[in-house]
């Protein structure tokens, strides 16, 4: 025998109190798959969170952070203050990157400039608080037809910076 609940579509639940009739999810709840015996409560986006996507009978709400903040954690479980490029967030707030480091994003930590000499290259464009150095040609690259500029190493994913 087929389970009668398997006929209940997303957005409904199989109501045991009503002879397993498919009942619509109550307000502020949802079921994203069929055959559910209960509907899940919708996530609420309040305070530092704002609603990115409203809850519907078939899908949960999604939150992001209010302007001036960015999400941390899967599903935006926490919000952290933005800083300007050339800064990082410390326990004392947003602070400029120290000399020799940069941050080209509004989040994350200041990272050391690329050391061009490790690759036998010279500095073509100096680094700033906001930008990495651009490494120029090594002597071997000066032969005709050689590319004169190598792009900076791709930025690694910034770690979680202090509050």
């Amino acid at each position: 025998l087929q389970d009668p609940c398997s006929n209940c579509p997303a957005g409904t639940f199989c109501d045991n109190n009503r002879n397993q009739i498919c009942s619509p999810c109550p307000p502020n709840s949802f079921s994203s798959a069929g055959g559910q015996r209960t509907c899940d409560i919708c996530r609420q986006c309040k305070g530092v969170f704002r609603t990115r996507k409203e809850c519907s009978s078939t899908s949960n709400a999604e939150c992001d952070c209010t302007p001036g903040f960015h999400c941390l954690g899967a599903g935006c479980s926490m919000c952290e203050q933005d800083c300007k490029q050339g800064q990082e967030l410390t326990k004392k707030g947003c602070k400029d990157c120290c000399f020799g480091t940069f941050n080209d994003q509004k989040r994350g930590i200041c990272r050391p400039w690329t050391n061009c000499s490790l690759d036998g290259k010279s500095v073509l464009v100096n680094g700033t608080k906001e930008r990495d150095v651009v490494c120029g040609p090594s002597p071997a690259d000066l032969s005709p037809g050689a590319s004169s500029v190598t792009p900076p190493a791709p930025a690694r994913e910034p770690g979680h910076s202090p509050q």
């Epitope: 899940d40 935006c76 479980s77 707030g93």
Partner: antibody, heavy 115, light 107 residues
């Protein structure tokens, strides 16, 4: 440095109103809201309510008839008022900054309700 | 409201051992669970947010896992300073709620 500090009378008589302030520094009251959370002696944590950066509030239904949370941006202070207190309201009261989880708390202040 | 139930109520272990603390939610709360450590006379301290993300400055012996209704805090190798009370809390739906706590004591 983000800091929150609760203050107020440590002793309140039954049926009176408990009034606490949370003085903050290191962040803007127009950017962050604050939650109030309490902890009766030897027990767990209980969320009372919150005031958001725009000034709107949310309260736990268990307190809604007797709680008011407000903000005074000129003094960098949030306040909690809880009316008609009983011995069951004896607790350490904390304020915590709203950042989606509670990363920054005050040190807490003990309020005893007794005649 | 969403009820969080922590177990065990008390856990007696020795330094160097592994601690496993459980938190069960009465409803699906996704991954919106945080873990806090509280020592006597102090405010709670955030350890884990979003079920599995270690907060800034928290040692990597602390880890969190789980989603939906079942969550776990693991301390891989207990240090003397880890003996305290641990609370889980949910930030999914209002009113925000906390578990009743697990006391981690020295055996």
């Amino acid at each position: 440095q983000v800091q929150l500090q609760e203050s107020g009378p440590g002793l309140v008589k039954p049926s009176q109103t408990l009034s606490l302030t949370c003085t903050v520094s290191g962040f803007s009251l127009t950017t962050y809201g604050v939650h109030w959370i309490r902890q009766p002696p030897g027990k767990g944590l209980e969320w009372i309510g919150a005031i958001w950066s725009g000034g709107s509030t949310d309260y736990n239904a268990a307190f809604i008839s007797r709680v008011t949370i407000s903000v005074d941006t000129s003094k960098n202070q949030f306040s909690l008022k809880l009316s008609s207190v009983t011995a069951a309201d004896t607790a350490v009261y904390y304020c915590a900054r709203d950042d989606g989880s509670f990363a920054n708390w005050g040190q807490g202040t003990l309020v005893t309700v007794s005649s | 409201e969403i009820v969080l139930t922590q177990s065990p109520g008390t856990l007696s272990l020795s330094p160097g051992e592994r601690a496993t603390l459980s938190c069960k939610a009465s409803e699906n709360v996704g991954t919106y669970v945080s873990w806090y450590q509280q020592k006597p006379g102090q405010a709670p301290r955030l350890l884990i947010y979003g079920a599995s993300n270690r907060y800034t400055g928290i040692p990597d012996r602390f880890s969190g896992s789980g989603s939906g209704t079942d969550f776990t805090l693991t301390i891989s190798r207990l240090e003397p300073e880890d003996f305290a009370v641990y609370y889980c809390g949910q930030t999914y739906s209002y009113p925000l709620t906390f578990g009743q706590g697990t006391r981690l004591e020295i055996k």
